[in-house]
């Protein structure tokens, strides 16, 4: 069967029907359907005016305008808001009421596209394998990235979050139109990786999506990840404004000027340096979502009541931090180079700057405890990777899972850890699953391009597609049309259970309490440390005028250290795109092509791409109860400060409303709220906060949409902000 022309709100569209073998099965493929009008720079997306006749939807459209990997030119287009649909068809009747899976790509909110990199004429985000193997409709789409998607003055002049609003427009378009393609508009699952996983999470929390989303999967990225929310957007907006010659003294004039500036100039005004970094690499990603008081009405930690009816899977890769650690400390991947205690201490101190000497020393001690027993370079390098994995991915994911569970009504929660090792031939043997390694298996690459893969890779891919599509159908990854290798138990606050995804899966794959000591450290011990003063927190200013070196952070406001965005001649951005591709220069509009397999290693065609999404991680405590973030009563306003902040601030460390603290022991006691920068143990909230939007337990009647005025709503930091 085949669909033929389909009538949508924009008009008729016609795709391609691709036959799948001799049994008569096929897949209808639609590429390049507009879901919004061509964009205007730094404006919200608008509905598409439609067309007459039948739109031939047979080719991917260009990605949204973005810098190339080398950051010296742009590719893509401002006219980029298009989506792609794969609809599986049986032999006789056209499909009806199929579950719908909408993919959101990663790329550090800086790069990427709905189709991903092209390798052997197969695009990374080609939905055919998922659609046909799982009998679901797959949708991918483009959204604006970089300054054009996320530049903000932190006020009404340029509220930001344009890329998130693009994503919402695509989701709403699917809801309104997918029935015509044979989809069930009441069974939409979002899934995404890295910045895409965080976007999935943010979309479930936004009041704009009420009633649109049934289920969600965050792979290596959640809303609470420390790189997701920009707390000082004005700093970054001014950096770009200065570069393109716009006035910076008055936000309204600056905004007007930026809106009429050549979008290519805006895009190239922001560069991510990659060498001579004063701070860890991810602190240089400046154009990301903001708390705008509208689309994201409050700190994400306070919005989980909005996701109370959405089934949720979240997980991380066991070495998600590897690519970032190898950028921050290049010796990690070099057999002939050593990681020293001094190197690691420096890295730790850069992440823990607002806790001063004590923060650095305590963290260093916790992570190097094993070094006395095993001083091998392999162990030391693994420690560095574990450290970045914990901070950027595992801990925030754990908190997100606990928060979802605590607020869920009928919704289910599942956690996973993806551990199938990276197939990058240039990596040391000890490297596990790097950031973005999971994508190729979810999208069925071992089946689509079999020559690059081994049977065990097909086993992993088959299992992941089965779990993911079963979940999309039923809300339970074990139940659906696809057989699974073992039973995946839900995550609960009692069991802290997670499924470890590997090539051999059985009953022992269901595990509990991942990295307990480290989760406890970050959510209890570290947070209780006092925040140091500005002088103590400020490092010695860098010398020289290279724009690659960030201004030293000042103050203890709620932002990560913000480096400059200059055109420093810094090396190109790491492969953080949607492609899962190594740093090979991009070709055409396809994204950087992945390194082909070399020798007999069977290296996969899609290596990791460091697009920085933080995957959710199951609870790691052996405490029984995972950390349920409190909702606090800090009274911080829902809109970030819009003042002329000057140099980039240091991220806060607990004097502004601290991140959640997991209960200890098996007491089942409620979570305690940290109380500022005192050295005493945090005390439980007293409940006089004026009804925070997200209660610590899921049975509350809290309104799903938090206030957007300047009320005293709780504003907890999204995660440990270092």
């Amino acid at each position: 069967a085949k669909l033929g022309a389909v009538y949508t709100e924009g008009g008729f569209v016609e795709g391609v029907n691709k036959k799948l073998g001799l049994l008569g099965d096929s897949v209808d493929i639609f590429k390049g359907i507009p879901f919004a009008a061509p964009t205007k720079a730094l404006e919200n997306p608008q509905p598409h005016p439609g067309w007459q006749g039948t739109l031939k939807a047979k080719n991917f459209k260009k990605r949204c305008l973005q810098a190339t990997i080398t950051q010296d030119s742009t590719y893509g287009d401002e006219d980029c808001l298009y989506l792609n649909i794969w609809v599986p068809q049986g032999r006789k009747q056209v499909s009806r009421d199929l579950p719908v899976m909408i993919w959101i790509y990663g790329g550090a909110f800086l790069m990427g596209s709905g189709h991903g990199a092209n390798f052997l004429n197969n695009y990374l985000y080609d939905g055919e394998e998922i659609a046909t193997r799982g009998n679901v409709i797959v949708v991918t789409f483009n959204y604006r990235v970089g300054p054009l998607g996320f530049l903000s003055t932190g006020d009404a002049n340029l509220p930001g979050n344009y890329g998130l609003r693009d994503q919402h427009m695509a989701i709403a378009w699917v809801k309104r139109n997918i029935a015509a393609f044979g989809g069930d508009p009441n069974n939409i699952t979002l899934f995404g990786e890295s910045a895409g996983g965080a976007s999935v999470s943010l979309q479930t929390l936004s009041p704009y999506n009420k009633g649109l989303i049934r289920r969600a999967i965050s792979q290596s990225g959640v809303a609470l990840s420390p790189w997701v929310i920009q707390k000082n957007p004005l700093f970054w907006a001014k950096k770009v404004a200065e570069k393109v010659g716009c006035p910076v003294g008055d936000a309204a004039r600056m905004a007007q000027c930026l809106k009429v500036t050549d979008p290519r100039a805006l895009t190239l005004a922001y560069k991510v340096p990659l060498a001579g970094l004063e701070y860890p690499m991810l602190h240089y990603v400046g154009f990301v979502p903001v708390i705008d008081g509208d689309f994201i009405p409050a700190d994400p930690i306070n919005l989980y009541a909005n996701a109370a009816d959405i089934d949720y899977i979240a997980g991380t890769n066991n070495m998600d931090g590897h690519i970032f650690a190898s950028i921050d400390m290049p010796a990690i991947n070099k057999g002939n180079k050593k990681v020293t205690e001094e190197d690691f201490y420096k890295l730790v101190s850069e992440f823990t700057i607002t806790k001063g000497l004590r923060g650095a020393k305590t963290t260093f001690d916790v992570y190097t405890e094993s070094w006395a027993q095993d001083p091998s370079q392999e162990n030391k390098k693994k420690t560095v990777v574990d450290f970045e994995t914990d901070v950027l991915f595992l801990v925030p994911t754990e908190i997100a899972l606990a928060q979802h569970r605590a607020n869920a009504k009928s919704a289910k929660t599942y956690a996973y850890l993806f551990s199938h090792p990276s197939r990058m031939p240039v990596y040391p043997k000890w490297v596990g699953a790097d950031h973005a390694d999971d994508i190729q298996y979810v999208f069925g690459k071992p089946f689509a391009t079999p020559t690059g893969y081994r049977p065990q890779d097909r086993t992993v891919s088959k299992a992941m597609i089965a779990y993911w599509t079963n979940f999309a159908k039923t809300g339970d990854p074990n139940m659906g049309d696809s057989a699974v290798p073992t039973h995946w138990e839900p995550y609960t606050t009692e069991n802290s259970g997670y499924l470890e995804i590997t090539k051999k899966m059985g009953s022992s794959s269901m595990k509990r309490s991942l990295r307990t000591n480290f989760l406890r450290y970050w959510t209890l011990t570290y947070l209780a440390l006092p925040t140091v003063t500005d002088q103590e927190a400020t490092p010695v200013p860098p010398t020289g005028d290279s724009e690659a070196t960030p201004v030293p952070p000042t103050g203890d406001s709620e932002t990560a250290p913000v480096p400059p965005t200059g055109d420093s001649g810094a090396p190109p951005v790491p492969p953080t795109g949607d492609s899962g591709a190594p740093p090979v220069p991009p070709t055409g509009d396809s994204g950087a092509p992945p390194v082909p397999p070399t020798g007999d290693s069977g290296a996969p065609p899609v290596p990791p791409t460091g697009d920085s999404g933080a995957p959710p991680v199951p609870p790691t405590g052996d405490s029984g109860a995972p950390p349920v973030p409190p909702t606090g009563d800090s009274g911080a306003p829902p809109v970030p400060p819009t003042g002329d902040a000057g140099p980039p601030p240091v991220p806060p460390t607990g004097d502004s409303g601290a991140p959640p603290v997991p209960p200890t022991g098996d007491s089942g006691a409620p979570p305690v709220t940290p109380t500022g920068d005192s050295e005493t143990a945090p005390v439980p909230p007293t409940g006089d906060s004026g009804a925070p939007p997200v209660p610590p337990t899921g049975d509350s009647e809290a309104a799903p949409v938090p206030p957007t005025d300047d009320s005293k709503e709780a504003q907890m930091p999204a995660v440990i902000r270092f």
Epitope: G4, A5, V6, Y7, T8, E9, G10, G11, F12, E14, P47, H48, P49, G50, W51, Q52, G53, T54, A172, W173, K175, R176, N177, A179, A180, G211, L212
Partner: antibody
């Protein structure tokens, strides 16, 4: 100027079929979709379906699938709507209506054709 | 399908009055359109894309809204404005509101 002229009133028995025509003039016939909307006596408007005159592609409201067929004749710039298995509740005024532009509203309407279904 | 709920279903007003009719969609929509229909006549396009007026429609008619809530306003009723008004959304399965009958008080 744009004109849509529909065929005259029809009286049909239950179980029969009716075919209503809509002749377009004043614009390029193949450049705009044509919709059919009906209105039962004293009731509101109900969308039935749409046809793209350039390639004959159609889409029908779920309620009418299997009973309605829309066709066009480009040589005479005419679209047709045939409704089969008529029942008394199909008694209504049937309108053809042309898109205004893009995915726009229905900017131009025929005068309507009353179809009465009675035994 | 997307449901459209118009209110009120009928209303009485006098010449010169300001009148407002609302239409709520069961989910967020891209565009809302409004039609005027007089007895025995075909509907006539009044407002398109929420707030735009086709040529020939008097400026006393205006439309506003986005997402799920939309409004048609007649700033100063004229005798020829007494009619039935329909809202209309264009998803892949277009639907109309049930109509608002505007009568002379």
């Amino acid at each position: 100027q744009v004109q849509l002229v529909q065929s005259g009133a029809e009286v049909k028995k239950p179980g029969a079929s009716v075919k209503v025509s809509c002749k377009a003039s004043g614009y390029t016939f193949t450049s705009y979709n044509m919709h059919w909307v009906r209105q039962a006596p004293g009731q509101g408007l109900e969308w039935m379906g749409v046809i793209n005159p350039s390639d004959g592609a159609t889409s029908y409201a779920q309620k009418f699938k299997g009973r309605v067929t829309m066709t066009r004749d480009t040589s005479t710039s005419t679209v047709y709507m045939e409704l089969s298995s008529l029942r008394s509740e199909d008694t209504a005024v049937y309108y053809c209506a042309r898109d205004y532009y893009g995915s726009s509203p229905l900017g131009y309407w025929g005068q309507g054709t009353l179809v009465t279904v009675s035994s | 399908d997307i449901q459209m709920t118009q209110s009120p279903s009928s209303l009485s007003a006098s010449v010169g009055d300001r009148v407002t009719i609302t239409c709520r969609a069961s989910q967020s929509i891209s565009y809302m359109h409004w039609y005027q229909q007089k007895p025995g006549k075909a509907p006539k396009l009044l407002i398109y894309a929420a707030s735009k007026l086709p040529s020939g429609v008097p400026s006393r008619f205006s439309g506003s809204g986005s997402g799920t809530d939309f409004t048609l306003t007649i700033s100063s009723l004229q005798p020829e404005d007494f009619a039935t008004y329909y809202c209309h959304q264009r998803s892949s399965s277009p639907t109309f509101g049930q109509g608002t009958k505007l009568e002379i008080k």
